[in-house]
């Protein structure tokens, strides 16, 4: 069967929403009222990978765009990017590892760990309107905890 994809939005633990910042970058900032319509809607696909009750492998595409979050090495550092793909071939059940995130939910906290780079997480800064990035620390200054709102 084809891969199942569901639409959702994400907010970090500070309740910042994610929006596009240029063609290939996301940033996190506080939105309210009608401005919430600016937030990115993800198409979250349930993909192949090691799975448990608390950990589910997913790919995060942007709804109605052929862009996926991916993790690659840049200057020897794991880096989060938005990568353009051929919409005829994506999403698929066996996504390349750079596109796969372990969605981990424990005690009301949702984290997205890179499958390619274990212990590196989708992160936001405390500061407003800063880029979403791949961070290698949890529980520090940067935010790695999110909530997810599924949408129609």
């Amino acid at each position: 069967a084809p891969v199942r994809s569901l639409h959702c939005t994400l907010r970090d633990a500070q309740l910042k929403s994610l929006v596009m910042s240029g063609p290939y970058e996301l940033k996190a900032l506080h939105l309210q009222g009608q401005d919430l319509e600016q937030q990115v809607v993800f198409s979250m696909s349930f993909v192949q990978g090691e799975e448990s009750n608390d950990k589910i492998p997913v790919a995060l595409g942007l709804k109605a765009k052929n862009l996926y979050l991916s993790c690659v090495l840049k200057d020897d550092k794991p880096t989060l990017q938005l990568e353009s793909v051929d919409p005829k071939n994506y999403p698929k059940k066996k996504m390349e590892k750079r596109f796969v995130f372990n969605k981990i939910e424990i005690n009301n906290k949702l984290e997205f760990e890179s499958a390619q780079f274990p212990n590196w997480y989708i992160s936001t800064s405390q500061a407003e309107s800063m880029p979403v990035f791949l961070g290698g620390t949890r529980g520090g200054q940067d935010i790695t905890d999110f909530t997810m709102q599924f949408v129609s």
Partner: antibody
Framework: EVQLVESGGGVVQPGRSLRLSCSAS????????MSWVRQAPGKGLEWVAY????????YYPDSVKGRFTISRDNSKNTLFLQMDSLRPEDTGVYFC????????????WGQGTPVTVSS | DIQMTQSPSSLSASVGDRVTITCRAS??????LTWYQQTPGKAPKLLIY???TLADGVPSRFSGSGSGTDYTFTISSLQPEDIATYYC?????????FGQGTKLQIT
């Protein structure tokens, strides 16, 4: 025995609030996504709220979004549905059900609690 | 949103009869389909998921089949305790929606 028991239903005027509870037993509550499904009198079933096992994921259809809030207390094996700004069309039996977004189906259901919104 | 249409909306059959209910989705749901049984005044009960997998403890006289947009629920030999309303539900994309139900009665 796996069991879900709802409570908190009743008769309420339009615009008022009601809070439903669902007590779970016989399984490890904190490991399961949970949902509320309602059934209007003589009608079919409508999925009205979902919360993931840890509480970080939620879903509401447009018909209740902004008015209903689902929450859970895993330490007390209890699911809640806070219903505000109630409308006559919210009248029905509200079922607590195990399952939701990830699994997709509902494998355990409570007996339901009736809610009537009328002036 | 994907809409689910069940047919017939009601039917009468005799004990021992083979009974078939169909469910049509407005789009391809790739076997992400469940069937529930609801007896009067009771909660729904899961019978079948993933179009054809029988839930734990469900008698083998119940079965499901289909693919794409068209699915079938069958009771091979109707028993008196099968009097109920049956619902299909898809879980391919949010919102997961239910069919309007098929009320099964015994003649």
């Amino acid at each position: 025995e796996v069991q879900l028991v709802e409570s908190g239903g009743g008769v309420v005027q339009p615009g008022r609030s009601l809070r439903l509870s669902c007590s779970a037993s016989g399984f490890i509550f904190s490991r399961y996504d949970m949902s509320w499904v309602r059934q209007a009198p003589g009608k079919g079933l409508e999925w009205v709220a979902y919360i993931s096992h840890g509480g970080a994921g939620t879903y509401y259809p447009d018909s209740v979004k902004g008015r209903f809030t689902i929450s859970r207390d895993n330490s007390k094996n209890t699911l809640f549905l806070q219903m505000d700004s109630l409308r006559p069309e919210d009248t029905g039996v509200y079922f607590c059900a195990r399952g939701g977004v990830t699994k997709g189906y509902f494998d355990v259901w409570g007996q339901g609690t009736p809610v009537t919104v009328s002036s | 949103d994907i809409q689910m249409t069940q047919s017939p909306s009601s039917l009468s059959a005799s004990v021992g009869d083979r009974v078939t209910i169909t469910c049509r989705a407005s789009g391809n749901i790739h076997n992400y389909l469940t069937w529930y049984q609801q007896t009067p005044g009771k909660a729904p009960k899961l019978l079948i998921y993933n179009a054809k997998t029988l839930a734990d403890g469900v008698p083998s006289r119940f079965s499901g089949s289909g693919s794409g947009t068209d699915y079938t629920f069958t009771i091979s030999s109707l028993q008196p305790e099968d009097i109920a309303t049956y619902y299909c539900q898809h879980f391919w994309s949010i919102p997961y929606t239910f069919g309007q139900g098929t009320k099964l009665q015994i003649t």
